[in-house]
Amino acid sequence: AITEAREEAKPYPLFPGPFPGSLQTDHTPLLSLPHASGYQPALMFSPTQPGRPHTGNVAIPQVTSVESKPLPPLAFKHTVGHIILSEHKGVKFNCSISVPNIYQDTTISWWKDGKELLGAHHAITQFYPDDEVTAIIASFSITSVQRSDNGSYICKMKINNEEIVSDPIYIEVQGLPHFTKQPESMNVTRNTAFNLTCQAVGPPEPVNIFWVQNSSRVNEQPEKSPSVLTVPGLTEMAVFSCEAHNDKGLTVSKGVQINIKAIPSPPTEVSIRNSTAHSILISWVPGFDGYSPFRNCSIQVKEADPLSNGSVMIFNTSALPHLYQIKQLQALANYSIGVSCMNEIGWSAVSPWILASTTEGAPSVAPLNVTVFLNESSDNVDIRWMKPPTKQQDGELVGYRISHVWQSAGISKELLEEVGQNGSRARISVQVHNATCTVRIAAVTRGGVGPFSDPVKIFIPAHGWVDYAPSSTPAPGNADPVLII
């Protein structure tokens, strides 16, 4: 059975008496080899009580002395087997062995849980020689133990390629429970059960768990760690923590807030970034997400004209990047715009409505009923049309642009005329005889030039050449109807 020492035990003196077989009386070590500082802790365990020989790894030397007596087997003396102490206390333990003087260069190494302890550990080896044997004491001290010091410590000594291993010394560092898993903050659906987990370890074990919800204990009796709390559902935010208890005391986990998912708050600060004739770019600041990520947003657009039928256009978009270009709007129109966003619970209310206007655009249709005829007496071409519908002018009409293309014997010339907005007729001089004149008309607003009407052709019979201004871009020929007068 292993021997066990608790920290309440009175410390032994380091060297209570001479080693068996030792002739030395002053016990002053011949040689002391500190591996690190020689701190003397409050708690020490002496390895020097004489005991039965080590039953573990034993080296039996083959060499005999002058009298030819075989040497006894080499083994570490027994020491305390189990040391229990509290965190941050100091501890010192040691291994001792008597080695015949015929062996040179004996070194003792310390090992913990199968790994050699190297570097700046508080290890000291002391040698006490006499006539036949040298007593070697290897001490190991830890000034302030931590949980990581828990484990099984052994001494190893090499002699003649033989390895001598001591019995293990088990160090058990006890302290308050240590959390290995704590509850995590969560966002949960209202009235829906969910789980929280708490796990803590010693030593000492067992560790018992109490759950606390909003300062009230959930379980009246302790539950063994680990513990899973099934919360039967919440209607409002709650704070949870767990208490871990062992014989050393109590550790309380961090408190975690469990939030109830709700519909988002409405977006704020809807603003106009840019307006064109047929589109408005808006941005918004999302409201509080209700503890659930936004999924998408809906832009609602109403015509602000009191005479409109009040229908609402809805445009759906992703929640990011809080920006949307509303398209297919009428030019020079007023709109009310609101934004609503949704999460897994539902839609927010609509943001405060804002007013926005589209700008003037180029007309969307061409003048209608274009007619062209030749006035031979004045050598002019008369053009007449009807102005496009007001709705489709997309702005205030400032005039018309007339394109007339003259084609004759492979030569093509385009001329452009600007006409004021008041009329719906124009007269252009014949530029070439024995030629085809193709006429197209576009309405013009401050927003730009609208589409040209379908081409109308008229043939001008031979009469003689007339000088004309330099031509503009050639127009492609086409098979549109020709009007001959």
Epitope: N191, W211, Q213, N214, S216, V218, N219, E220, Q221, P222, E223, L229, P232, G233, T235, A238
Partner: antibody, heavy 118, light 106 residues
């Protein structure tokens, strides 16, 4: 299956003592507290307190301190309610119940009628 | 201590007529439990933690509420549902019961 079986009815004289037992079966006794609830004739339920079966520590509601004692014999998975110096107003049905999380009483004994009469 | 007030004290209903029982707490509580008791019997767990049906309880029973106001509803009471119903709070010691609501046949 979980069961709480209480001792039988008692007729006592004022000033006497009574000990009501509540034997648990079908679960690990030390894992759940035992609550005691009183119901006077024609009245509602009144929580008297509970005993921690893990540590043996009792908790008493106001009005149930002094003459009322909760105790345990864990070797036989039994909780006890002892009332000393009985008075007429102690006449009631006494229930034991198993307590789980959130102080919910999920299993109840059948009740023990204690009658105090001279 | 938290005082629980149940209303009405008595509820007279015809079978099938919806029953709504109220339990008000003198201060906010975390959860409310409900128990049913018939004459000469021990209380029977009905609803755990405000809205969770106890084992074997039919779905015509439901619970709701939060803060200081809690409700037990029997959507269409059967003859065996005529009994006394008690609420019990979880939040702070001492655990307290309401005074009870008796549901009787009209």
């Amino acid at each position: 299956q979980v069961q709480l079986v209480q001792s039988g009815s008692e007729l006592k004289k004022p000033g006497a003592s009574v000990k009501v037992s509540c034997k648990a079966s079908g679960y690990t006794f030390a894992n759940y507290g035992v609550h005691w609830v009183r119901q006077a004739p024609g009245q509602g339920l009144e929580w008297m307190g509970w005993i921690n079966t893990y540590q043996g520590e009792p908790t008493y509601a106001q009005g149930f301190t002094g003459r009322f004692v909760f105790s345990l014999d864990t070797s036989v998975s039994t909780a006890y309610l002892q009332i000393s110096s009985l008075k007429a107003e102690d006449t009631a049905v006494y229930y034991c119940a198993r307590g789980v999380r959130y102080a919910y009483m999920d299993y109840w004994g059948q009740g023990t009628l204690v009658t105090v009469s001279s | 201590e938290i005082v629980l007030t149940q209303s009405p004290a008595t509820l007279s209903l015809s079978p099938g007529e919806r029953a709504t029982l109220s339990c008000r707490a003198s201060s906010s509580v975390g959860y409310m439990h409900w128990y049913q008791q018939k004459p000469g019997q021990a209380p029977r767990p009905l609803i755990y933690a405000t809205s969770n049906l106890a084992s074997g309880i039919p779905a015509r029973f439901s619970g709701s509420g939060s803060g200081t106001s809690y409700t037990l509803t029997i959507s269409s009471p059967e003859p065996e549902d005529f009994a006394v119903y008690y609420c019990q709070q979880w939040s702070s010691n001492p655990r307290t019961f309401g005074g009870g609501t008796k549901v009787e046949i009209k």
